[in-house]
């Protein structure tokens, strides 16, 4: 019951997180004009990953897309890439986790497969959340650097009579949305991984019983069957089972690269 709740909650938290990552990526307010030097501006500038906007006090807002790809800063391209990777991984993770949910029955899917899928989606959510947090943090760092550079320029270039107020940008709402959303996706992913660990022992115990049952029945059957099964003495049988169990644990704890394809 607790495992189902943990898995369900992990799914919901990740879903909210990924929705937030998508929202942050689409938002125009990644950086907003710093109004410290000019709090009474009649023109307000803000920028996103895809376009920059100007809102006039008249109520008119004009947005212009970044129609160039090569002319954009490498950092901006990197942030875009991180956010998109985060969204893609998160979306795949959501798809996988829907089928992995314990409360949903799909055909004759075994619990071991559900455990694998839960872990896979959990890892995907963790990576997705990290991508979003990294993307937002890189952008924030870029803003801080530019902010102090423009502040330095502002106070060194005041020699003339005419004031040229340089537009400085500070953190926009999208950054906070991105950080929170990334964190939620990360937490959701961790919860999915915890849920998977909760699923794994149940499966192992179940298999252990089945193996023991077949092992005992073999002891009473003719030798020909024994030979055909490939099991030797009881010790040999146990060793093979242990090995099988260990391999299965490894699959659950450390998915192979094929699990992501």
């Amino acid at each position: 019951m607790a495992v189902t709740a943990c898995q369900g909650l992990g799914f919901v938290v990740s879903l909210i997180g990924i929705a937030g990552i998508i929202a942050a990526t689409c938002m125009d307010q990644w950086s907003t004009q710093d109004l410290y030097n000019n709090p009474v501006t009649a023109v307000f500038n803000y920028q996103g990953l895809w376009r920059s906007c100007v809102r006039e006090s008249s109520g008119f807002t004009e947005c212009r897309g970044y129609f160039t790809l090569l002319g954009l800063p490498a950092m901006l391209q990197a942030v875009r890439a991180l956010m998109i990777v985060g969204i893609v991984l998160g979306a795949i993770g959501l798809l996988v986790s829907i089928f992995a949910l314990k409360c949903i029955r799909i055909g004759s899917m075994e619990d071991s497969a559900k455990a694998n899928m839960t872990l896979t989606s959990g890892i995907m959510f963790i990576v997705s959340g990290l991508c979003a947090i990294a993307g937002v943090s890189v952008f924030a760092n870029m803003l801080v650097t530019n902010f102090w550079m423009s502040t330095a320029n502002m106070y060194t270039g005041m020699g003339g009579m005419v004031q040229t107020v340089q537009t400085r940008y500070t953190f926009g709402a999208a950054l906070f949305v991105g950080w929170v959303a990334g964190g939620l996706t990360l937490i959701g992913g961790v919860m999915m991984c915890i849920a998977c660990r909760g699923l794994a022992p149940e499966e192992t115990n179940y298999k252990a019983v089945s193996y023991h049952a077949s092992g005992h029945s073999v002891a009473y059957k003719p030798g020909g069957f024994k030979a055909s099964t490939g099991f030797g003495s009881n010790t040999k049988n146990k060793k093979i089972y242990d090995g099988g169990a260990r391999t299965e644990d490894e699959v659950q704890s450390y998915p192979s690269k094929h699990d992501y394809v």
């Epitope: 501006t41 009649a42 023109v43 500038n45 920059s52 100007v54 006039e56 008249s58 004031q163």
Partner: antibody, heavy 119, light 113 residues
Framework: DVQLVESGGGLVQPGGSRKLSCAAS????????MHWVRQAPEKGLEWVAY????????YYADTVKGRFTLSRDNPKNTLFLQMTSLRSEDTAIYYC????????????WGQGTSVTVSS | DVVLTQSPSSLTVTEGEKVSMSCKSS????????????LTWYQQKPGQTPTLLIY???TRKSGVPDRFTGSGSGTDFTLTINTVQAEDLAVYYC?????????FGAGTKLDLK
């Protein structure tokens, strides 16, 4: 057609008060910022105050700050300018105007209402 | 506050002549965000209310004759009337619409000989 009609002007004693109104029609009043601009006799234009569409931002010229209060009633499509502690230099024609256009430009202006501050 | 200085204060021209008037700002009115200058030009004919001529320093309002041209950037702006007509007799004001208070210039009075 956009129409702005000012009212409430007249003769006021120095130190007195007056409330000007501007009735708007022909556009979605609640969506646009509104301004008051005045013009003293034989003088140039002087911007007085601005109020945003939802009254979230209100700005005043330094010459009227603390004496004039700008407000609006969106359901009634009306703009108000409450003037107190009036001085002789406040004598002017008061226009209400709207930033209906791009570039914060004041495209539509009322015909103005005359305020005379004199003893 | 942004101070706008208009020159000359008055101009006397003959019909058909080309005329230019200047408006200088104490601060830059150029907005980096959209690469536009937030300066507006108005025309006020005798006994009438002001009317909008040009916004964003150089964009003519629809319906304004193309003989009116706005130019300049940053702190220096110019309004040019290519062939002055009798109906252009008016006072021309420039206005800062970049930051509050939205100051006006003192105006340039255009007279005909």
């Amino acid at each position: 057609d956009v129409q702005l009609v000012e009212s409430g002007g007249g003769l006021v004693q120095p130190g007195g008060s007056r409330k000007l109104s501007c009735a708007a029609s022909g556009f979605t009043f609640s969506s646009f910022g509104m301004h008051w601009v005045r013009q003293a006799p034989e003088k140039g234009l002087e911007w007085v105050a601005y109020i945003s569409s939802g009254s979230g931002s209100i700005y005043y010229a330094d010459t009227v700050k603390g004496r004039f209060t700008l407000s609006r009633d969106n359901p009634k499509n009306t703009l108000f300018l409450q003037m107190t502690s009036l001085r002789s230099e406040d004598t002017a024609i008061y226009y209400c105007a709207t930033s209906y256009y791009y570039g914060n430009a004041l495209e539509y202006w009322g015909q103005g209402t005359s305020v005379t501050v004199s003893s | 506050d942004v101070v706008l200085t208009q020159s000359p204060s008055s101009l006397t021209v003959t019909e058909g002549e080309k005329v230019s008037m200047s408006c200088k700002s104490s601060q830059s009115l150029f907005n980096v965000g959209n690469q536009k200058n937030y300066l507006t030009w108005y025309q006020q004919k005798p006994g009438q209310t002001p009317t909008l001529l040009i916004y964003w320093a150089s964009t003519r309002k629809s319906g304004v004759p193309d003989r009116f041209t706005g130019s300049g950037s940053g702190t220096d702006f110019t309004l040019t009337i290519n062939t002055v007509q009798a109906e252009d007799l008016a006072v021309y004001y420039c206005q800062n619409v970049y930051s509050y208070p939205l100051t006006f210039g003192a105006g340039t009075k255009l007279d005909l000989k």
